[in-house]
């Protein structure tokens, strides 16, 4: 014989000894009908705030208040946003490793410093965990076939460098 609890809709509960579908009481929910009890709604307060409110058919969803971010499945914890020089990992905020930086507050990942030499430039200022390196102007490199002659120009004392 089919139990009439099987016909209960989400938002209700049903006890087998009295198989009548009853609405979940306030502040409780059931996403599956026919369960013997409704679940207590999650509360979002303190460092949490509501992303979804609890209804008779679904639980509340929480997010973290501004300046904090979620950790764990379904945002079980709130942690202060990462500072510049850090990135968010599954274990929380971690300092950027040597040779990487993050200049953003609260978001972003650690990115490698710019490789100045790839553009034929020198490093003007070394990088930190919070700031990228600053590259200098292009380095003038001379090949062996280059001839340099200094010729007087524009009157006495005037010289110009000519690369031929």
């Amino acid at each position: 014989v089919q139990n009439s609890c099987d016909n209960c809709q989400p938002g209700t509960f049903c006890r087998k000894y009295n198989p009548v579908c009853k609405s979940c009481p306030p502040s409780t929910f059931s996403s599956i009908g026919g369960q013997p009890n409704c679940n207590i709604c999650r509360v979002c307060a303190g460092y949490f705030r509501f992303k979804k409110f609890c209804s008779s058919t679904h639980n509340a969803e929480c997010e973290c208040i501004e300046g904090f971010h979620c950790l764990g499945p379904q945002c079980t914890r709130c942690e202060k946003d990462c500072r510049p020089g850090q990135e968010l990992t599954k274990q929380g905020c971690k300092t950027c490793s040597l040779g990487t930086f993050n200049d953003q507050n609260g978001t972003g990942v650690c990115r490698p410093w710019t490789n100045c030499s790839l553009d034929g430039r020198s490093v003007l200022k070394t990088g930190t965990t919070e700031k990228d390196v600053v590259c200098g102007p292009p380095v003038v490199s001379f090949s062996p076939s280059t001839t340099i002659s200094v010729t007087p120009e524009g009157g006495p004392g005037g010289h110009s460098l000519q690369v031929l």
Epitope: P25, P26, S27, V43, A45, K52
Partner: antibody, heavy 113, light 106 residues
């Protein structure tokens, strides 16, 4: 900064359908939900429903059968539709951000023949 | 649905006086939220998470309570506090408001 603005007809005939628009700025509809709340003249506040960040909705069971809330995320607009209007639907209609920290200025709707 | 009963419906207070508004819930709620509404204006979130003052709310206001009984208090009434105050629960939908308490200046 965060702003919400309601728009719609001031006067609607009984039995007709009311369509209101809430245009938001300063936040994204894909991050935050938007409520509709109404207030009949000289009376208290009544929560009508909400559309969430993911497009899901929750409604006030008392008017659920006549109510629908939808959105257009590209235009940052939320829509409220109430059908089979009655004179007691005459009210100031407000939209508000999910945390009720920002409200629109409201739009007055009169249902009368 | 959770029904919120506010009392008193109307109250008149003199400047400097202490004012208390209560809100009773038909079933237990985790936190209470309060709004201030002045004539012709939209409501403003006034107190959240039962006791936290919203941005810009003077600290003469306070909120307290738990379970089914909550209250909003004004330590020393000022003329600018004359308004209607509503309580609201967020524990489960439908989110419900109290019927409001009109606070007048004596």
């Amino acid at each position: 900064q965060v702003q919400l603005k309601e728009a719609g007809p001031g006067l609607v005939q009984p039995t007709q359908t009311l369509s209101l628009t809430c245009t938001v700025s300063g936040f994204s509809l894909t991050s935050d939900g938007v409520h509709w709340i109404r207030q009949p003249p000289g009376k208290g506040l009544e929560w009508m429903g909400i559309i969430y960040y993911d497009g899901g909705t929750d409604y006030n069971s008392a008017i659920k059968s006549r109510l629908s809330i939808s959105r257009d995320t590209s235009k940052s607009q939320v829509f409220l539709k109430i059908n089979s209007l009655q004179t007691d639907d005459t009210a100031m209609y407000y939209c508000a951000r999910i945390h009720f920290d920002y409200w629109g200025q409201g739009v007055m709707v009169t249902v009368s023949s | 649905d959770i029904v919120l009963t506010q009392s008193p419906t109307t109250i008149a207070a003199s400047p400097g006086e202490k004012v208390t508004i209560t809100c009773r819930a038909s079933s237990s709620v985790s936190y209470m939220y309060w709004y201030q509404q002045k004539s012709g204006a939209s409501p403003k979130l006034w107190i959240y998470d039962t006791s936290k003052l919203a941005s810009g709310v003077p600290n003469r206001f306070s909120g307290s309570g738990s379970g089914t009984s909550y209250s909003l208090a004004i330590n020393t009434m000022e003329t600018e506090d004359a308004a209607t105050y509503y309580c609201q629960q967020w524990s489960s939908t439908p989110l419900t408001f109290g019927s409001g308490t009109k606070l007048e200046i004596k």
